[in-house]
């Protein structure tokens, strides 16, 4: 039995997969910031995790996926205000009792040092200095990502 948040995440990813190709993104769109091979958009408004997930989807992007600690640090370096939290694409899967990225993969426990509980209705946010577990209903900012690629590419759940 999937939670409403897990179902929402799956539905959005599936709807995005129906488009099998899109032109490769050569440059980051206006207001997006380039970080290596990604474009990141830091919202100014606040939303619960579900709405943030949906907002990134309408922008043909996804909530931020972080590959490793190095990428986390570089992303945090782009956050200008100390106290502000941003949702990323990681939430607690009740059915699998583990942190799960919105592309379906599980968190490698060495990647992020999460402050807070791993429990139902918990989603992950990052600040300039830390990674936090928050209630998914909390209204905070969020980060969308688009992959930069110079060629026509298939759209996969983690793209």
């Amino acid at each position: 039995q999937k939670s409403s948040i897990e179902k929402c995440s799956v539905d959005i990813q599936q709807s995005r997969n129906k488009t099998t190709e899109r032109p490769g993104l050569l440059n980051c769109p206006i207001y997006w910031q380039q970080l290596r091979e990604k474009c990141l958009l830091f919202s100014h408004t606040v939303n619960p995790w579900n709405n943030s997930l949906a907002d990134c989807s309408t922008k043909e992007s996804s909530l931020l996926l972080i590959r490793d600690k190095d990428e986390l640090i570089h992303t945090q370096n782009l956050i200008r205000d100390k106290a502000i939290l941003f949702w990323i694409g990681l939430n607690f899967s009740l059915s699998e009792k583990n942190w799960k990225w919105i592309n379906g993969s599980f968190l490698n426990s060495n990647d992020l040092e999460i402050r807070g509980d791993a429990k139902e209705n918990s989603c992950i946010s990052i600040s300039q200095t830390s990674v936090y577990s928050e209630y998914c209903s909390t209204e905070i900012r969020w980060i969308c990502q688009k992959e930069l690629t110079p060629v026509r590419n298939k759209v996969y759940p983690d793209s």
Partner: antibody, heavy 117, light 110 residues
């Protein structure tokens, strides 16, 4: 180049509902937020509210109970309804693109709405 | 939420610099780096000039610059030109997904 065009009645009777539509050309309404802003003659700007393309909205607390916003992606349009209008709602109404939720980079030319019987 | 406070008028001669202030509170200007500025000529729609306190969109001359200290943001127009004569409005994110504008400043080029 993104262009926005407001349309709707220029005259509305007191207690009735003001209805405006903004048509966006030169780009899709998806991927951005869209706001309504108004300006009474000789006065400053007032933010009315915004709509996300996911359909959710944010509204100015002072107008919240009277505002309805919607969008029609197939027509590349978004709309504002302001109910129970009074003479104080007479203003030039602008629609604007609201990229991140705190500033407005493209504006319509504005449409004057007069509330009078 | 109250309007941000701007001086009603400002003036300067061609070539001079003029600074327009925009004062808010810790709940808007002071609390976020999300201040923007707009230029409005009579009978026209506002034009986007500055965002995120000091970022300038493409096409806006570098004579226009923005800054912030505490609860007060400022727009500086250097090398004043006749076409800079207009009304200028600041705005700020004000928490809870709201935006608030200043009352506007009429800039006169003497």
């Amino acid at each position: 180049q993104v262009q926005l065009q407001e349309s709707g009645p220029g005259l509305v009777k007191p207690s009735e509902t003001l209805s405006l539509t903004c048509t966006v050309s030169g780009g899709s309404i998806s991927s951005y937020y869209w706001s309504w802003i108004r300006q009474p003659a000789g006065k400053g700007l007032e933010w009315i509210g915004r709509i996300y393309t996911s359909g959710s909205t944010n509204k100015n607390p002072s107008l919240k109970s009277r505002i309805t916003m919607s969008e029609d992606r197939s027509k590349n349009q978004f709309s504002l309804k302001l109910s129970s209008v009074t003479a104080a709602d007479t203003a030039v109404y602008y629609c604007a693109r609201d990229p991140l939720g705190s500033f407005f980079d493209y504006w319509g030319q504005g449409t004057l709405v007069i509330v009078s019987s | 939420q109250s309007a941000l406070t701007q001086p009603p008028s400002a003036s300067g001669s061609p070539g001079q610099s003029v600074t327009i202030s925009c004062t808010g509170t810790s709940s808007d200007v002071g609390g976020y780096n999300y201040v923007s500025w707009y230029q409005q000529h009579p009978g026209k729609a506002p034009k986007f000039m500055i965002y995120e306190v000091s970022e300038r969109p493409s096409g806006v001359p570098d004579r226009f610059s923005g800054s912030k200290s505490g609860n007060t943001a400022s727009l500086t127009v250097s090398g004043l030109q006749a076409e800079d004569e207009a009304d200028y409005y600041c705005s700020s994110y004000a928490g809870s997904n709201n935006v608030v504008f200043g009352g506007g400043t009429k800039l006169t080029v003497l």
